[in-house]
């Protein structure tokens, strides 16, 4: 028998520095977690103790903090090289800055293979990107070789900016011939490493003949055997065992997100490359693990540029940006309108001639807007200003919901109106009218939404049975502020870009902004 240790991360999302327990900014260092310096300590400890170790990343290193905003992926290549990652799969967020924003900082600078079997380049891009990412890679481990085959969510064109010269194929269809090719090379130990979410990971384990282990990402799935060490609730045991169509037991793993855990899986193979046993658990990277001093010093060196960036002007406002709780928790506020407009603008993807865009709607809990911005400071808006407005380090995500769920959400928005509570919704691409004289749960008297399948966008009444795409904070997608109906009834959820980054990009693009209160949210009394 031959034993392999797979160490794995996924959805790190720019958490190069240690974070608090909820993966936001580290405040009390003695209780902070993760970060590349701490990760390196643990990885090195395992490499020294065990003979056959692979360190793999299942995508979405890009996007999530000011590190990515400033360094644009150069930080990913640098620190992943320093940690000696053995391979990485492309995630959807690796395309956030377009194909060039992937090629130059990461693909050209990574000293390890970057993989995806289901992304095919065409046109002029094919020769430019040739060899910079691979469908699979054979890695030497001790005296053996291990094949790693990559995959990426085929939804990427709706979630990021891969352009028109990359085709995202069905994962299973694309993976099978590559695995077959590895078999012809006499590679009999094969790991599928990718970024399509836990459901697809399980399907790959079930359907792709020859895959021995699946290491996934995208869905931030936490798996654990035994008593979990922190706040995350396991979605299943680690590893999650799938019985393949040809009768094999295939371990599937994922390691939550944000570099909080290091996935740790031990696999025993027989001489023919069959998995005999698999066991392990994610390792919580808490403060009991010291940060490596040399990596930490490097982080501090790179940090300097971030502090300078925070105070630079992104753009100007010529109006007061009213982000006060007195406004945003009671009525339409122009800060809410600005943020929602930025959220929609960040999700412009012309992927179908029938649609002017794939999504037109935004909702945003008023309680998530934490500060106004005064225009009487020469109109200047900085990252620091925006961090005061959006201090929670969240993301603006894409969900699919039925109209009936949206109606419930808007009823919840005003079910206890007048108490300055955070659930009051700010909107974009939506016109809502409330009648507060009616009983809670029956106060939405008009709800019109902006069409997407139209050449001239206009507002039409919400249809209860229709499925709509909506951009919203991850806080709401996870049922925050009492929006349990969103969490329970959503049909799809893809995590998006860092909230501050979305707004800062929009302001930089617009240069001068002047959002108004324009009748998106209205109140009436009487009959309708």
């Amino acid at each position: 028998a031959w034993e392999l240790t797979i160490l794995h991360t996924n959805d790190v999302h720019s958490r190069l520095e240690q974070t608090s327990e909820d993966s936001s900014k580290c405040v009390n260092a003695s209780r902070c977690m993760g970060g590349v310096a701490r990760l390196f300590t643990k990885v090195q400890q395992i490499r020294r103790a065990e003979p056959n170790v692979l360190l793999l990343d299942a995508g979405d290193q890009y996007q999530g903090t000011i590190w990515f905003t400033v360094y644009k992926g150069a930080e990913v290549a640098h620190f992943m090289n320093a940690l000696r990652y053995d391979a990485m799969a492309l995630g959807n967020h690796e395309f956030d800055n377009g194909v060039e924003g992937l090629i130059e900082p990461l693909l050209k600078e990574a000293k390890f293979p970057i993989l995806s079997a289901n992304i095919k380049a065409k046109g002029p891009l094919a020769s430019q990107i040739s060899g910079l990412y691979l469908p699979y890679k054979v890695l030497p481990v001790g005296d053996e070789v291990v094949g790693i085959v990559g995959y990426t969510s085929k939804e990427t064109p709706f979630l990021s900016n891969p352009g028109t010269n990359l085709v995202f194929e069905d994962e299973i269809t694309a993976l099978q011939p590559e695995v077959d090719k590895l078999k012809t090379l006499n590679v009999n130990k094969i790991i599928a490493l990718g970024h399509s979410g836990f459901e697809m990971d399980k399907l790959i384990a079930q359907k792709v003949r020859g895959v021995d282990v699946v290491v996934g990402g995208h869905s931030n799935t936490f798996l654990y055997t035994g008593n979990p060490p922190s706040k995350e609730v396991p979605a299943g045991k680690y590893p999650f065992i799938v019985t393949s169509d040809d009768g094999r037991k295939v371990p599937v793993v994922q390691a939550y997100a944000f570099g909080k855990y290091l996935g740790y899986l031990k696999i025993e193979f027989d001489e023919r490359g069959n998995v005999i046993s698999s066991h392990g658990n994610p390792i919580l990277l808490n403060s009991s693990i010291p940060e490596d001093p040399s990596i930490k010093a490097d982080i501090n060196k790179w940090r300097i540029k971030l502090d300078n960036y925070s105070t630079q002007e992104l753009g100007k406002t010529i109006v007061y940006l009213d982000g006060s709780s007195q406004s945003c928790r009671f009525r339409e506020c122009n800060m809410g309108n600005l943020i929602c407009d930025a959220m929609i603008n960040n999700n412009l993807r012309h992927t179908d001639e029938m649609f002017w865009n794939h999504v037109s709607m935004c909702i945003l809990n008023g309680g998530g807007i934490r500060s106004p911005i005064d225009e009487r400071n020469n109109g200047t808006i900085t990252w620091e200003n925006l961090a005061a407005v959006l201090p929670f380090g969240g993301t603006f995500d894409l969900v699919q919901l039925k109209g009936s769920t949206l109606k419930k959400a808007f009823e919840h928005s005003v079910h206890r109106y007048g108490q300055s509570t955070g659930e009051f919704l700010q909107v974009g691409g939506i016109h809502v009218v409330y009648d507060l004289s009616r009983k809670p749960g029956d106060r939405v008297v008009k709800l019109d939404v902006l069409c997407t399948k139209c050449r001239v966008p206009s507002y039409d009444p919400l249809k209860m049975d229709e499925v709509y795409k909506v951009i919203l904070p991850n806080f709401l997608a996870n049922g925050g502020d009492g929006f349990q109906m969103i969490k329970d009834e959503l049909l799809r959820h893809d995590s998006g870009d860092q909230d501050i980054n979305v707004v800062s990009t929009y302001i930089s693009k617009m240069k001068v902004i002047y959002p108004a209160v324009e009748g998106r949210i209205k109140f009436s009394t009487g009959s309708h």
């Epitope: 000696r84 053995d86 990574a110 000293k111 390890f112 293979p113 060899g131 691979l134 890679k137 054979v138 890695l139 030497p140 070789v145 094949g147 590895l182 090379l185 006499n186 590679v187």
Partner: nanobody
Framework: QLQLVESGGGLVQPGGSLRLSCAAS????????IGWFRQAPGKEREGVSC????????YYADSVKGRFTISRDNAKNTVYLQMNSLKPEDTAVYYC?????????????????WGQGTLVTVSS
Amino acid sequence: QLQLVESGGGLVQPGGSLRLSCAASGFTLDYYNIGWFRQAPGKEREGVSCISSSEGSTYYADSVKGRFTISRDNAKNTVYLQMNSLKPEDTAVYYCAADRYYYCSLHVSQYDYWGQGTLVTVSS
């Protein structure tokens, strides 16, 4: 496009020397391992030597240890294989191959990019 071109092959007498070159175009060699492989008529391709991208560590097959030396010149984007004390059993087509990783091995399957090969004949 990543391309590897071997040169320096030819006919040499037993005990003689040759220096093979592997020139890369379309990419810089810094982040790539380079391996030299050979295939004799009717035999499988086998690893001869490799040089890693990270520390420039070198590895040799037992059959060539002490006789062959691999080196790289990143400025010239070229890797060399100095072959001394050649034997008739060294006769083969020699290929260079590249792969992007820190560590090299003599496993054929590790390498993603291959040259067309250059023929080395050792005969009196």
